[in-house]
């Protein structure tokens, strides 16, 4: 069977060669070919070329649309997981671990503490902070979590804040705070999460996370 296929391919190739040669002869105006024959062959060839060019255009259009879809409006999303830190800073630390998401380089986690975006637009930004505290062991002030914005050359802004009173449970009672909202971010803008007492934050799987999604 393979041998027969090979013979068939060679025959088709030979026919193509003859067809091309005939077009060449038509073009040079060889006497042995009738005018009618040449016209027919030429229009056949033009038809082939037109088909090829149309296909090429369609492919080009499809590709440019794909590029537009992919390039102009790529998905930008991030979800990072809390990381226990020895630092006494009130800014929570995050890591790309576990069930994390970092869609592409248009959003980055910088210094383990802030998500920075490269494109301007509306973003849904959220954070969940789970903490374990006890009324007696803690100060009178409530546990406060803040979602903050820092843009290049501009002061920090508090976008969202939530407060919870401390639990009476011993040694401590777990509580969760969820923050989320839609905000306009400029290129280079960073968002981060601040808490009043980072030592009370729970870092167990799924308890504390932070992320954003470009709308």
């Amino acid at each position: 069977h393979r041998r027969l296929d090979k013979i068939e391919d060679e025959r088709n190739l030979h026919e193509d060669f003859v067809f091309m040669k005939t077009i060449q002869r038509c073009n040079t105006g060889e006497r042995s070919l009738s005018l009618l024959n040449c016209e027919e062959i030429k229009s056949q060839f033009e038809g082939f070329v037109k088909d090829i060019m149309l296909n090429k255009e369609e492919t080009k259009k499809e590709n440019s649309f794909e590029m537009q879809k992919g390039d102009q409006n790529p998905q930008i999303a991030a979800h990072v997981i809390s990381e226990a830190s020895s630092k006494t800073t009130s800014v929570l630390q995050w890591a790309e671990k576990g069930y994390y998401t970092m869609s592409n380089n248009l959003v980055t986690l910088e210094n383990g503490k802030q998500l920075t975006v490269k494109r301007q637009g509306l973003y849904y930004i959220y954070a969940q902070v789970t903490f374990c505290s006890n009324r007696e062991a803690s100060s009178q002030a409530p546990f406060i979590a803040s979602l903050c914005l820092k843009s290049p050359g501009r002061f920090e802004r508090i976008l969202l804040r939530a407060a919870n009173t401390h639990s009476s449970a011993k040694p401590c009672g777990q509580q969760s705070i969820h923050l989320g909202g839609v905000f306009e971010l400029q290129p280079g803008a960073s968002v981060f999460v601040n808490v009043t007492d980072p030592s009370q934050v729970s870092h167990g799987t799924g308890f504390t996370s932070f992320g954003l999604l470009k709308l």
């Epitope: 050359g153 501009r154 002061f155 508090i158 400029q186």
Partner: antibody
């Protein structure tokens, strides 16, 4: 009612120093970024310096960088501007202004009445 | 630093006139443009922030528009108390900068 009251202005010789104060009331001072803006006689407004609510971040106009220092004492609800190596071109009315914290756009929504600083020999 | 070019530097108008002041920036500042009104011997007063948002308590005859590099302050029907100097300001990037001002005088 929000109030900002500047003090400390006066006549000083070139190369001298002066410290301006701005007493704030009617709002939670530490929640707001603050700025100093000046206006030379018969001229336009010039932003001089700004400080974040916590006092951790400061910004300066190039014309005063290295000579002026902005600071704040949140326990006293007071904003300061320490002016050193003063020049004749620093002569102006100095306004203290509050930066609206609830906006993306950092507008200066409340202003003091200003204090005049004259640098002359 | 971002330069703010305000025009005209002065204009004369009558009560009831529509007045337009423009501000052009040396680079795009998105919508980070604010407008202030200042009367002689007084502190400036915020009118418009974020290019088009009217500050609380400011009459609706004042409006702002624009984004990027071109911004406009419009007073739809000039009132006697509107004769003052108007300044645009950018807060896109420090150092914040002001336009040179536009003095609106009586014709």
């Amino acid at each position: 009612e929000v109030q900002l009251l500047e003090s400390g202005g006066g006549l000083v010789q070139p190369g001298g120093s002066l410290r301006l104060s701005c007493a704030a009331s009617g709002f939670t001072f530490s929640d707001y970024d603050m700025s100093w803006v000046r206006q030379a006689p018969g001229k336009g407004l010039e932003w001089v310096s700004g400080i974040s609510g916590s006092g951790a971040t400061t910004y300066y106009a190039d014309s005063v960088k290295g000579r002026f220092t902005i600071s704040r004492d949140n326990s006293k609800n007071t904003l300061y501007l320490q002016m050193n190596s003063l020049r004749a071109e620093d002569t102006a009315v100095y306004y203290c202004a509050r930066d609206s914290s609830g906006s993306y756009y950092y507008p200066l929504d409340y202003w003091g009445q200003g204090t005049l600083v004259t640098v002359s020999s | 630093d971002i330069q703010m070019t305000q025009s005209p530097s002065s204009l004369s108008a009558s009560v009831g006139d529509r007045v337009t002041i423009t501000c052009r920036t040396s680079q795009s500042i998105s919508s980070y443009a604010n407008w202030y009104q200042q009367k002689p011997g007084k502190a400036p007063k915020l009118l418009i922030y974020g290019a088009s948002r009217l500050e609380s308590g400011v009459p609706s005859r004042f409006s702002g528009s624009g984004s990027g590099t071109d911004f406009t302050l419009t007073i739809s029907s000039l009132q006697p108390e509107d004769f003052a100097t108007y300044y645009c300001q950018q807060t896109y990037s420090t150092p914040w900068t002001f336009g040179g001002g536009t003095k609106v005088g009586i014709k």
